[in-house]
């Protein structure tokens, strides 16, 4: 009821709580002497549903039959209206419309850990829109039943706060949940289970790993579990992998040997537990243990290449280069590389440890037969050495690969193709394709890249350290025993017209002709491989077309003679450069007047 209802009453029949679709009768009646003062016939009783008038009647009482009420609560208020006065509230009532509870479905119970407590969940079914009380019952051995009630509005979970113990793990327990409201009640189907069915072990804890004698092949994983655990499953993976390795173990008693771990690899380990072979459920996975396996001595051999440079009549410079071992080959942190240089006839040898980089340069006599051996060392040992005899890689002309070409192949790739050498192609043991950024000064500090190709291949795609708009000097070597032949070409993955022309730095007269000298275009402005230079000239103050001379680009060339200028005429000269994509803008302009022979 609403308010004090001093002036009258509102009654609801059959009940304040009704089933959806039912009809209710609402009666509003005034108490004696509570009507309008002068004329009780003038009493006008008005029934409101929330704020909307739904009925009125003159007299001491009002009857109203109401249908079609929605689910939930509806408020009815009765008011009295007298002439020349405001409406007065008489009384009111709330009507609760709902449905009987549906049968709770999918009742399931679980106890988390041997020391945990039993908790059950179920599906309530559709909302009753009424106060509904859920009672959970659990019957078990020793003639005992537990009961707990839930008075939340949306109740689908109850924790009994009671712990099942494993004295008789096969004993049956039966759970049932009953929903009750004013319109009816309904019970779930019973759920029967044993201790072993519902106890979900806590995840293992205190996980540790030990490597006997710091060896990856003698690795044991340790953990702690609840006392009744029978089964464990282990999963582990390298930290950078998404795929797990899985192992199932029975009666492990908190330890298991792992035999297939890779050295010097960070792994993630997790463990789960179960109480019975086919009953119950697995625990959650434990927290991860992350651990790095110990190093083992490197496997595999270094890929070594070299470059020779003539210094003078008696000396040559040897630059050695090698590639890092892969992680799986290095099997640890490479501490240093050991380089041994030996003169094969005299037996002289020198050994040096290189740390921090993968190249080494030395000067040796031009005479004698020289060999190098390079190996990589970690804390556990060294890789097998890679041995190379130092030879003149381009000496055998008949071994030089033919028709070498270099073509752009998509973004930052160059496809290098060649034909086998004229000499018996079957003599070729392997090809080596080498590339480095082209620097006009022939800078030996420029990084060297290479790849090896099988003797039956006549192409290679180079992509490592290839940048757009940079010209590369590419060499293809054919190696056969202690002989080698080579061919070279320039190539780029992407090109456009150079950003500037060459800068003419000098024009000198020499026996009736002139020699033009220029500075190379900076590498970053060449925009690919230069094919030609053009020298333009025309008479000063003339509108005639300039004459031009086109000269093929050569790395080391930075001067060129012109002998078609007239004496005692002032000319303007400038230069451009061309790639396959087009011509650069003009370089600087220089004026020059050829003096000619004195009369």
């Amino acid at each position: 009821k609403i308010d004090a209802c001093k002036r009258g009453d509102v009654t609801v029949k059959p009940s304040h709580v009704i089933l959806l679709g039912s009809t209710v009768n609402i009666t509003c009646s005034l108490k004696p002497r509570q009507g309008c003062f002068h004329y009780s016939r003038r009493n006008k009783l008005i029934l409101y549903k929330f704020d909307r008038r739904i009925n009125f009647h003159h007299g001491h009482s009002l009857n109203s039959q109401v249908t079609g009420l929605p689910l939930g609560t509806t408020l009815f208020v009765c008011k009295l209206a007298c002439i020349n006065s405001d409406e007065i509230q008489i009384c009111g009532a709330e009507i609760f419309v709902g449905v009987a509870p549906e049968q709770p479905q999918n009742l399931s119970c679980i106890q988390k850990g041997e020391q945990g407590t039993v908790a059950c969940t179920w599906e309530r079914g559709r909302d009753t829109h009424l106060y509904t009380e859920y009672t959970l019952q659990l019957s078990g051995p020793k003639n005992l039943t537990w009961q707990k009630q839930c008075k939340d509005i949306y109740c689908d979970y109850l924790d009994f706060g009671i712990n099942l113990t494993p004295e008789s793990p096969e004993s049956n327990f039966t759970a049932k949940v009953t929903a009750v409201n004013s319109l009816g009640s309904s019970s779930s189907l019973p759920s029967t289970f044993t201790f072993l069915d519902i106890v979900r072990p806590l995840p293992p804890w205190d996980i540790r790993i030990k490597f006997q004698k710091a060896s990856v092949s003698r690795c044991t994983l340790y953990w702690r579990d609840e006392g009744l655990v029978l089964l464990n499953r282990l999963r582990y993976r390298p930290s950078n992998s998404r795929l797990w390795n899985m192992v199932n173990v029975t009666k492990a008693k908190g330890r298991h040997d792992l035999l297939d771990l890779k050295p010097f690899t960070e792994y993630e380990f997790q463990i789960s537990s179960k109480l019975h072979l086919y009953k119950g459920s697995w625990s959650d996975w434990s927290e991860s243990l992350r651990a790095q396996t110990p190093e083992e001595e490197p496997t595999g051999m270094l890929d070594v290449w070299y470059m020779k440079r003539h210094i003078d009549y008696s000396r040559q410079q040897i630059s050695l280069f090698w590639k890092n071992l892969s992680v799986s080959e290095a099997r640890g942190k490479i501490l240093h590389y050991q380089v041994t240089l030996q003169e094969l006839t005299g037996g002289k040898a020198m050994t040096q440890n290189i740390t921090g980089h993968t190249s080494w340069t030395t000067v040796i006599p031009r005479t004698g037969n020289w060999a190098v051996a390079v190996s990589a060392a970690n804390s556990k040992g060294s890789s097998l050495p890679t041995r190379i005899n130092i030879m003149n890689l381009c000496e055998a002309g008949l071994l030089a690969p033919r028709q070498v070409s270099a073509n752009s192949e998509g973004m930052d790739n160059i496809l290098v193709t060649w034909q086998p050498p004229r000499k018996d192609p079957s003599a070729v043991q392997e090809y080596v394709v080498e590339w480095r950024e082209l620097h006009p000064g022939g800078d030996t500090q420029v990084p060297l890249n290479w790849l090896r190709s099988r003797p039956y291949n006549v192409s290679a795609l180079i992509s490592e350290n290839i940048k757009s708009y940079i010209c590369y000097e590419i060499r293809v070597y054919a190696l056969s025993g202690d002989q080698g032949g080579c061919s070279s070409i320039l190539g780029n993955s992407k090109h456009k017209a150079p950003l500037s022309g060459p800068h003419i730095n000098a024009i000198t007269e020499e026996k009736g002709s002139i020699l033009i000298s220029w500075n190379s275009i900076p590498v970053q402005e060449q925009m690919g491989c230069l094919l030609h230079y053009r020298i333009y000239w025309k008479e000063r103050d003339s509108n005639s077309q300039p004459q031009l001379c086109e000269i093929p680009y050569r790395v080391s060339q930075n001067s060129h003679p012109i002998n078609s200028l007239q004496p005692r005429v002032t000319y303007v000269l400038w230069m451009t450069a061309l790639t396959a994509a087009g011509e650069s803008s003009h370089g600087n302009e220089r004026e020059f007047c050829l003096q000619g022979k004195a009369n």
């Epitope: 407590t117 078990g140 051995p141 020793k142 005992l144 537990w146 009961q147 707990k148 924790d159 009994f160 706060g161 009671i162 712990n163 099942l164 113990t165 004295e167």
Partner: nanobody, 129 residues
Framework: QVQLQESGGGLVQDGGSLRLSCAAS????????MAWFRQAPGTEREFVAG?????????FYDNSVMGRFTISRDSAKNTMWLQINNLKPEDTAVYYC?????????????????????WGQGTQVTVSS
Amino acid sequence: QVQLQESGGGLVQDGGSLRLSCAASGRTFSNYAMAWFRQAPGTEREFVAGLSGSGGDTAFYDNSVMGRFTISRDSAKNTMWLQINNLKPEDTAVYYCAAATHVVVSYGLVRKRGTYDYWGQGTQVTVSS
């Protein structure tokens, strides 16, 4: 000095109802386990119903009284009740109130006499046919 005092027993007809009370004094038991036991002449004292004291109270009943007996308590008043409906002659016994100084969370312990530290003097319930 801790005391438990039962009341509400008496003579009642077969099918009748009673409400037994247990008032605790000397300490608060609102968060601890409490139970009702009964003892008929010439028999062992047996568990009837109990409250665990854990997380909003779980009620325990011996299967022989399940559905007829309802155990409850008012923590503020330090009082426990046992509502008995549809009494039968075999319910005739002295009914004892018991209280523990701990929460009972292990299945089965609730029905063991040794679980409880304090006992009342008992109240007689007689059901005549």
